[in-house]
């Protein structure tokens, strides 16, 4: 983690590779996994629409003790608006419904390959 | 209310050793990456160590092999161990919350620390 | 290691006077992943410990007042206060927070004449 994703050329990127960074994060994870994500820990599940990049990080922020998410999370705080802190709730997130992180994030996987096949970069 | 209070400091000899301690309250404790910041006399700021909510720990390199940075989540408490103490380590020493995600974004009132024979 | 150079490293102004203040890094602080800025800006009055004023280039902190701007990207970054209030008094250091080490710049000290 230390040089955190490399040093990126002056200017602004294309959402796109903004986009596809975070889905090879969230790839490598899915791939790389052995034990059981940040020890099976559980967090709130999230309706995959707009507002998800923060209600992903309202999520993710409050598993502690897990490095395996935490270039996720810094990548997540940029896609959202506003800083997120741990113990903060949307709308977006299902309040009922807790599920593994690694769970999490094969869904949050598959719903951004979607977004990037369609071409819904923001 | 988020609150950072350092605690420890103190005059020591050249190659000594102190323990600073940072009690946070207000907040998630366990959920945010932790730094230690020192301000010298001539009021530089230096990044000295930083332990994130994953665990991982990074160091400048003018206090690695020196210092330890630690947390203990149970009692929302940041540590740093000090040791081989040298006269440039004088300085204000700050716990600052955050760094890795955001910037950081709260800290405490400081502890002076001088080393000197 | 990045390294951040701010300039002035002084200046003395009135009240009322817009401010701007710059800080350059050696290397680029976009991170291609979120493209965003990992630079902050901080404020210390005499006695006091630093207050975070903006972090990701110009995002505002919460709380703090609207005549404090930041802009830039990539390696240029500037401070901006755009009617200097007396409390203003206080040195402003900028920060890289895109990679380990974090590094500060040396400060630029703001004046009441």
């Known amino acids: 983690l230390t040089c955190l994703g490399g040093f990126a050329s002056p200017g602004p990127v294309p959402p796109s590779t903004a986009l596809r960074e975070l889905i090879e994060e969230l790839v490598n994870i899915t791939q790389n996994q052995k034990a059981p994500l940040c020890n099976g820990s559980m967090v709130w599940s999230i309706n995959l629409t707009a507002g998800m990049y923060c209600a992903a990080l309202e999520s993710l922020i409050n598993v502690s003790g897990c490095s395996a998410i935490e270039k996720t999370q810094r990548m997540l705080s940029g896609f959202c608006p506003h800083k997120v802190s741990a113990g903060q709730f949307s709308s977006l997130h299902v309040r009922d419904t807790k599920i593994e992180v690694a769970q999490f994030v094969k869904d949050l996987l598959l719903h951004l390959k979607k977004l990037f096949r369609e071409g819904q970069f923001n | 209310e988020v609150k950072l209070v350092e605690s420890g400091g103190g005059l020591v000899r050249p190659g000594g050793s102190l323990k600073l301690s940072c009690a946070a309250s207000?907040?998630?404790?366990?959920?945010?990456?932790m730094n230690w910041v020192r301000q010298t006399p001539e009021k530089r700021l230096e990044w000295v160590a930083s332990?994130?909510?994953?665990?991982?720990?990074y160091y400048s390199d003018s206090v690695k092999g020196r210092f330890t940075i630690s947390r203990d989540n149970a009692r929302n408490t940041l540590h740093l161990q000090m040791s081989s103490l040298r006269s440039e380590d004088t300085a204000m020493y700050y716990c600052?919350?955050?760094?890795?995600?955001?910037?950081?974004?709260?800290w405490g009132q400081g502890t002076s620390v001088t080393v000197s024979s | 290691d990045i390294v951040m150079s701010q300039s002035p490293s002084s200046l003395a102004v009135s009240v009322g006077e817009k401010v701007t203040m710059s800080c350059k890094s050696s290397?680029?602080?976009?991170?291609?992943?979120?493209?965003?800025?990992?630079l902050a800006w901080y404020q210390q009055k005499p006695g006091q410990s630093p207050k975070l004023l903006i972090y990701?280039?110009?995002t505002r902190e919460s709380g703090v007042p609207d005549r404090f701007t930041g802009s830039g990207s990539g390696t240029d970054f500037t401070l901006t206060i755009s009617s200097v209030k007396a409390e203003d008094l206080a040195v402003y250091y900028c920060?890289?927070?895109?990679?380990?080490?974090?590094?500060f710049g040396s400060g630029t000290k703001l004046e009441i004449k």
């Open positions: 600052a919350r955050d760094g890795y995600l955001y910037a950081m974004d709260y």
């Open positions: 207000g907040f998630t404790f366990s959920s945010y990456a």
């Open positions: 332990i994130s909510s994953g665990g991982n720990i």
């Open positions: 290397q680029n602080l976009l991170y291609s992943s979120n493209q965003k800025n990992y």
């Open positions: 990701w280039a110009s």
């Open positions: 920060q890289q927070y895109y990679s380990y080490p974090f590094t």
